[in-house]
């Protein structure tokens, strides 16, 4: 028995082959024997049953010369899985179509970190097909009926190519995944004390109308709980702030990519934020991290300090030295100081291995003045 | 081409109420957020109001905050400005102003209505 | 409100001449900037939006810049016709806010 796969929706072509290689008599049957369509001498097609039953069957009259009489089904139904037998030359073939249905749940339009489950559908106990699913820059997928994709990154957005395999025999289909997200999970901003501050969200899609609601928490590192800094609403892409706080005097942009500024970085803002945006007709929400890391030098009586606050790795390095010379202190910490510093201009620098995420200078005039 | 014609101008009392009317041509109205901007004599250009192309979000300028009220009428091409409580420091031509559809620039301006509060 | 200030408040001079007039604002705005000139008795027209973009129609002497919230207008070389009264308005929200303006007069 040959097998012929099809999918829901779209055409299969049942073969049905001559020995001779020329044009014969053949009928193609359900295996309750009703006639589906024949050709009985004359080089006609003649149909069975009324024309609307059977108008979705059709053969291809031109390979008929050379010995091949296939059964076209067009626009397949679920129903059509079943056995259809080829009468010619005194033999019957028979040939098994397997008509598979493929549902995206939640659907191909998702958010990022949301999961998609591909699930094949038949009325036919067939055992089990291997579906995968490759995308264009190589990433492959595979399962058996049900095919699942965990955590979806923006960048599995895009068309992906799918073969379902059932004894040797295969069927593609494709399917194109729209997945919505931040084009960074999570940034960080460095700056020095009193400087200004500005935090961009940027989407990694553009959709003509954009529709939804946000707020902004922020967990201060020198605070005992997070605080809501901002609620905001997206009308066709215009952004309108429902509700801010008054310290920090936040700022937020109107238009796309969402955008927030804070007039002053000041040590009591440093920390970790969360950006949650909520848009409609879509469960769950998008979530991007921001984090503000402040640095402050100061000179208080007799000593030079260098702080910096906020979200650093174990493996950032701050260094306090006077300019153009040698490092005084270099310490994996969040503070360095220097006790009775000598007169002239000092530098602050925070590192992570050569690279240097931010510097901070101070003009210390004598020792024992206060001087910021 | 698109055009705005401001109207609804004139004289008025202080604590009087006037409807100023900027009617649109030329353009799908509710696709651009619109803007009222005023210029009192001889001084600088002040912006006083914006709707949203959706005309559900509403902005006001803290000098007019609850006596100004923008609305606009999608299936005239209007906009409108009712003033209440007026006074005399609201004395100013007034210019209907469309921004563009992904910028938030004014690109097309009316040539201005003049109000003027006096006793 | 985001604060747009200014400067010069008032300027002369001379055909030919280059022109440079900055804004600053009271917090950062992206580029959410843009120059518009005014000649009495008539409505304000767009030169630059955007911090730099030339608006269609506007002569290729008008220029514009971003330096973190400070914004520059460029006129590289004065023509007759450009003897105005110069506003920068910040559209990045709401309340807008334009500065005080700079007339520029021949000198």
């Known amino acids: 028995k040959t097998l012929v796969l099809g999918k829901e929706g779209e055409s299969a072509e049942l073969p049905c082959e001559s020995s001779q290689k020329k044009i014969t008599v053949f009928t193609w049957k359900f295996s309750d024997q009703r006639k589906i369509l024949g050709q009985h001498g004359k080089g006609v097609l003649i149909r069975g049953g009324s024309p609307s039953q059977f108008d979705r069957f059709d053969s291809k009259k031109g390979a008929w010369e050379k010995g091949s009489f296939p059964l076209i089904i067009n626009k397949l139904k679920m129903e059509d899985s079943q056995t259809y037998i080829c009468e010619l030359e005194n033999r019957k073939e028979e040939v098994e179509l397997w008509v598979f249905k493929v549902t995206f749940s939640p659907g191909t339009s998702l958010l990022q970190g949301q999961s998609l489950t591909l699930t094949l559908d038949s009325n036919s106990k067939v055992s089990n097909p291997l579906t995968e699913c490759k995308h264009k820059k190589g990433k492959v997928v595979s399962g058996s009926k049900v095919l699942s994709m965990s955590n979806l990154r923006v960048q599995d957005s895009d068309f992906w190519n799918c073969t379902v395999t059932l004894d040797q025999k295969k069927n593609w289909f494709g399917m194109t995944l729209s997945v919505l997200g931040f084009q960074k999970a999570s940034s960080i901003v460095y700056k020095k004390e009193g400087e200004q501050v500005e935090f961009s969200f940027p989407l990694a899609f553009t959709v003509e109308k954009l529709t939804g609601s946000g707020e902004l928490w922020w967990q201060a590192e020198r605070a005992s709980s997070s605080k809501s800094w901002i609620t905001f609403d997206l009308k066709n892409k215009e952004v309108s702030v429902k509700r801010v706080t008054q310290d920090p005097k936040l700022q937020m942009g109107k238009k796309l990519p969402l955008h927030l500024t804070l007039p002053q970085a000041l040590p009591q803002y440093a920390g970790s934020g969360n950006l949650t945006l909520a848009l409609e007709a879509k469960t769950g929400k998008l979530h991007q991290e921001v984090n503000l890391v402040v640095m402050k030098v100061a000179q208080l009586n007799n000593t030079l300090t260098c702080e910096v606050m906020g979200p650093t790795s174990p493996k950032m390095r701050l260094t306090l030295k006077q300019e153009n010379q040698e490092a005084r202190v270099s310490e994996e910490q969040k503070v360095v100081q220097v006790v009775a510093p000598e007169t002239g201009l000092w530098q602050c620098l925070l590192s992570e291995g050569d690279k240097v995420k931010m510097d901070s200078r101070i003009q210390v005039l004598s020792r024992g003045v206060n001087q910021t | 081409e698109v055009e705005l014609l401001e109207s609804g101008g004139g004289l008025v009392q202080p604590g009087g109420s006037l409807r100023l009317s900027c009617a649109a041509s030329?353009?799908?109205?509710?696709?651009?957020?619109m803007s009222w901007v005023r210029q009192a004599p001889g001084k600088g250009l002040e912006w006083v109001s914006g709707i949203s192309g959706s005309g559900e979000n509403t902005y006001y300028a803290d000098s007019v905050k609850g006596r100004f009220t923008i609305t606009s009428d999608n299936s005239k091409n209007t906009l409108y400005l009712q003033m209440n409580s007026l006074r005399a420091e609201d004395t100013a031509v007034y210019y209907c102003?469309?921004?563009?559809?992904?910028?938030?620039?004014?690109?097309?301006w009316g040539k201005g209505t003049t109000v003027t509060v006096s006793s | 409100a985001i604060q747009m200030t200014q400067s010069p408040s008032s300027l002369s001079a001379s055909v030919g001449d280059r022109v440079t007039i900055t804004c600053r604002a009271s917090?950062?705005?992206?580029?959410?900037l843009g120059w518009y000139q005014q000649k009495p008795g008539k409505a304000p027209k767009v030169l630059i939006y955007e911090a730099s973009s030339l608006q269609s129609g506007v002569p290729s002497r008008f220029s514009g810049s971003r330096s973190g919230t400070d914004f520059t207008l460029t006129i590289s070389s004065l023509q007759p016709e450009d003897f105005a009264t110069y506003y920068c308005l910040q559209d990045y929200t709401y309340p807008y806010t334009f500065g005080q303006g700079t007339k520029l007069e021949i000198k």
């Open positions: 030329g353009l799908t109205f509710s696709t651009f957020a």
């Open positions: 917090h950062g705005i992206r580029n959410d």
């Open positions: 102003a469309k921004e563009g559809y992904n910028w938030n620039y004014m690109d097309v």
